[in-house]
Interface confidence: low
């Protein structure tokens, strides 16, 4: 018995061939011997089966001795043995129809679980293997689960259903809702304007939800909400904003915040969360602000940084075009009785300068100038 696998919602064509290459009488029946369709001369006739409005044949092939049964918009319950009667012969074809669906929405938050459920006809024992867009392989039976979805899981999942050594392939598009970056760090000199951007890693026609940015300043004992906002069809409207700092938020995506001045008291870490309508859970992005200040007080030239710096970062003070006078893996360095000239304070990581601040030291009878 020939086995044919079909996909729910698809169209399948079951073949039936006579030895005579001409139009002769044929009938297609199901396993209950109920006629589905056949011919009377050159006319297509249909029986009382439940496939009535979804069954068809190709009259153009009858003259060649081919009498296919076409079933449109396949349903799991169409799984059956179909019998073609032609020339006193019976050809049997077993049709097995499978469906594969995602548990809920195909738009899932990063960290959530994806469950794929296989609909299969009674008596079948299929196995399923799915390959994620990043090449991960998942195998299972009637259900497959993937926990802790990552951004790289966005895209087309290709699932192969295997039954009776036959395969049928399903493609399911999954969108993992996340920010492009889990974390970002901004380095600024004291007084500079700060721009925070939170680009999303997905696009949808309508995006509605609400969000907030909580900030933990390095100098503060507890975090505070800097801003809360609503998102309606990709339009941003601020609900509440802290008075200090005076944050501004862009009205369009990507989510964009401006801090007018980088000050030591603002240095620290923030967590932006976004709750999307009709989704449980939230999207998160961490953002960090490092602020540098170079000052001269009496005979002491000091360079300081505030905020979340890694222990391997180097802070240096050097006179322009000269060797560093002082270089330490610390958050503050200083030089006593600095020579007159343009001094540079550098924050660097493995030789790469992340932040630079210049201060002009004048001869001792003058006051310092910060360019």
């Amino acid at each position: 018995k020939k086995v044919v696998l079909g996909k729910k919602g698809d169209t399948v064509e079951l073949t039936c061939t006579a030895s005579q290459k001409k139009s002769i009488q044929f009938h297609w029946k199901n396993s209950n011997q109920i006629k589905i369709l056949g011919n009377q001369g050159s006319f297509l006739t249909k029986g009382p089966s439940k496939l009535n409005d979804r069954a068809d044949s190709r009259r153009s092939l009858w003259d060649q001795g081919n009498f296919p049964l076409i079933i449109k918009n396949l349903k799991i319950e169409d799984s059956d043995t179909y019998i073609c009667e032609v020339e006193d012969q019976k050809e049997e074809v077993q049709l097995l129809v499978f469906g594969l669906t995602a548990n809920s929405d195909t738009h899932l938050l990063q960290g959530q679980s994806l469950t794929l459920t296989l609909e299969s006809p009674p008596g079948s024992s299929p196995s399923v293997q799915c390959r994620s867009p990043r090449g991960k392989n998942i195998q299972g039976g009637k259900t497959l689960s993937v926990s802790q979805l990552e951004l790289q899981d966005s895209g087309t999942w290709t699932c192969t259903v295997l039954q009776n050594q036959k395969k049928v392939e399903f493609k399911i598009d999954i969108v993992v809702l996340a920010f492009q970056k889990a974390s970002s760090i901004v380095y600024k000199k004291e007084g500079e304007q700060v721009e925070f951007s939170f680009p999303l890693a997905f696009t949808v026609e309508k995006l509605t939800g609400s969000g907030e940015l909580w900030w933990q300043a390095e100098r503060a004992s507890s975090s505070k909400s800097w801003i809360t906002f609503d998102l309606k069809n990709k339009e941003v409207s601020v609900k509440r904003v802290t008075q200090d700092p005076k944050l501004q938020m862009g009205k369009k995506l990507p989510l964009h915040l401006t801090l007018p001045q980088a000050l030591p008291q603002y240095a620290g870490s923030g967590n932006l969360t976004l709750a999307l309508e009709a989704k449980t859970g939230k999207l998160h992005q961490e953002v960090n602000l490092v602020v540098m200040r170079a000052t001269q007080l009496q005979k002491n030239l000091t360079c300081e940084v505030w905020g979340p710096t890694s222990p391997k970062l180097m802070l240096s003070l050097k006179l322009e075009n000269k060797e560093a006078k002082v270089s330490k893996r610390e958050k503050a360095v200083w030089v006593l009785n600095p020579e007159a000239g343009m001094w540079q304070c550098l924050l660097s990581d493995s030789g790469q300068v992340l932040l630079e601040s210049n201060i002009k030291v004048l001869p001792t009878w003058s006051t310092p100038v910060q360019p």
Partner: antibody, heavy 120, light 111 residues
Framework: EVQLVESGGGLVQPGRSLRLSCAAS????????MAWVRQAPGKGLEWVAT????????YYRDSVKGRFTISRDNSKNTLYLQMNSLRAEDTATYYC?????????????WGQGILVTVSS | DIQLTQSPSSLSASVGDRVTITCRAS??????????MQWYQQKPGKAPKLLIY???NLASGVPSRFSGSGSGTDFTLTISSLQPEDFATYYC?????????FGQGTKLEIK
């Protein structure tokens, strides 16, 4: 220590059959996909077939589809390659490989290889 | 099928040299920023040995003088300081698409 030992190679006439075996040890065989990779004398490497950890899914290169069958017996920690309708171009050293399937797909352990010669 | 082209096909070098082998794919082997490219080393009469997976990850037990880089269609295997045991043939391999394909190989010989 991971070990893969192939057997069953030799000289065979075109059109005939041969079955290669690969005995695996040193790892949980039933947790890993396995594959066969071949190398014609003096030539490069060519992937032949892959089988999933439980044997439910198999993949073949087009030139061997319908002629070769990859299978496994997890209770015996053994991988097989049944080769039918052999052709001269199937002459090669056949390597049994363990296929890591959790990130990229790659062959992290290889057997020493077994020579299959198809000639009349 | 994805074709992989290695260059050079053969290369003569001395112990201590820095050597670079490139592999170009006929189409991208990246999936969601994940590069499905491997490098193997094969010595005469021996089975291949995995050196690098996912374009840049060093396989277990492989010396740190070997490194991989690249993304999309262009990949590089670098040996920072050749050792006598490194003279062999090197193959790149993609596993983005069925069938998995290998480069034609680069034979590294002693100068």
């Amino acid at each position: 220590e991971v070990q893969l030992v192939e057997s069953g190679g030799g000289l065979v006439q075109p059109g005939r059959s041969l079955r290669l075996s690969c005995a695996a040890s040193g790892f949980t065989f039933s947790n890993y996909g396995m594959a066969w990779v071949r190398q014609a004398p003096g030539k490069g490497l060519e992937w032949v077939a892959t089988i999933s950890y439980d044997g439910s899914i198999t993949y073949y290169r087009d030139s061997v589809k319908g002629r070769f069958t990859i299978s496994r017996d997890n209770s015996k920690n053994t991988l097989y390659l049944q080769m039918n309708s052999l052709r001269a171009e199937d002459t090669a050293t056949y390597y049994c490989t363990r296929e890591e399937q959790y990130s990229s797909w790659y062959f992290d352990f290889w057997g020493q290889g077994i020579l299959v010669t198809v000639s009349s | 099928d994805i074709q992989l082209t290695q260059s050079p096909s053969s290369l003569s070098a001395s112990v201590g040299d820095r050597v670079t082998i490139t592999c170009r794919a006929s189409q991208s082997v990246s999936i969601s920023s994940h590069d499905l490219m491997q490098w193997y080393q094969q010595k005469p009469g021996k089975a291949p040995k995995l050196l690098i997976y996912d374009a840049f990850n060093l396989a277990s037990g492989v010396p740190s003088r070997f490194s991989g880089s690249g993304s999309g269609t262009d990949f590089t295997l670098t040996i920072s300081s050749l050792q006598p045991e490194d003279f062999a043939t090197y193959y790149c391999q993609q596993s983005k698409d069925d069938p998995y394909t290998f480069g034609q190989g680069t034979k590294l010989e002693i100068k």
